[in-house]
Amino acid sequence: MAVTACQGLGFVVSLIGIAGIIAATCMDQWSTQDLYNNPVTAVFNYQGLWRSCVRESSGFTECRGYFTLLGLPAMLQAVRALMIVGIVLGAIGLLVSIFALKCIRIGSMEDSAKANMTLTSGIMFIVSGLCAIAGVSVFANMLVTNFWMSTANMYTGMGGMVQTVQTRYTFGAALFVGWVAGGLTLIGGVMMCIACRGLAPEETNYKAVSYHASGHSVAYKPGGFKASTGFGSNTKNKKIYDGGARTEDEVQSYPSKHDYV
């Protein structure tokens, strides 16, 4: 029950996280700056990964895409790539985890298969979350190092004079959405990995001394049953018969000419 809950919660948390990563990637408010203020209008500029927008206090807003724009920071392409990789991995992880959910039965899928799928999706969520956190952090670092506070010979706006002013980029809402979403996806992935441990049937072969029948090279191992953890329905307990095979820690059970006293 605890495993099912952990797996289900991990799935839901990752789902919310990936939705957040998608939202952050699409948002325009990755960085913001006030262009100018005056009694008539205040102009606010904000940029995303794909387009830049201008909003005025009158309510007028216009956005323009970067499609053909040259001279964009190279880091922007890296951030785009990280976010897209995060989304793709997260989406695949979600798809895999749906089939891995213990509460969903698909044919005669064994618990070991579900455990493997849970682990795979968990790892995918972890990598997805890390990609999102890395992407947002790279962008934030780009703002701080290159654009955080710059002196520009800039037009101070309507009603203003031409003078050198301090202009500053600030972190937009998308950065915080991305950090939180990446963190959630990461946590969800960890929960899936924890759930995987509970799903996997621990197979322990009890070892015993092998008894050799005269003239035959067949070892019979009593107690060679698969022990179940109780999480799986291990009804296929089999005795193990293997031709002369011994366990690694087994010593030779009959003397040979190489024995030393």
Epitope: Q33, L35, N45, E56, A152
Partner: nanobody, 121 residues
């Protein structure tokens, strides 16, 4: 590079009218504000009129009611209709455009070469 080309200046009698036009061309991303400044000999450059992308306008107190600014966002042009001109309006008029390319703090300011307006009494 971005070029601003002004036209419409000249000599006019006091009380007369003139229309100044300015067209921006080149590697423009999204011009945020366009306007007109003027500089009389021996004086500082001052803002005459300004219009934002959304159509919000600003006028210097000395020209309110006499001058009208208009713009075409798609063509990146701005015009200044000057009526009831006075001798004190005599100056070199400069077109100004403020572009907001992404990740350029404060955006970029561009200026025209200027056009002379002379109002005779």
């Amino acid at each position: 590079a971005v070029q601003l080309v002004e036209s419409g200046g000249g000599l006019v009698q006091a009380g007369g009218s003139l229309r100044l036009s300015c067209a921006a061309s080149g590697s423009i991303f999204m011009i945020n504000a366009m306007g007109w400044y003027r500089q009389a000999p021996g004086k500082q450059r001052e803002l005459v009129a300004d219009i934002s992308r959304g159509g919000s306008t600003y006028y210097a107190d000395s020209v309110k009611g006499r001058f009208t600014i208009s713009r075409d966002n798609d063509k990146n042009t701005v015009s200044l209709q000057m009526n009831s001109l006075k001798p004190e309006d005599t100056a070199a008029y400069y077109c100004h455009a403020h572009d907001v390319p992404p990740f350029v703090p404060g955006g970029k300011s561009y200026w025209g070469q200027g056009t002379q307006v002379t109002v005779s009494s």
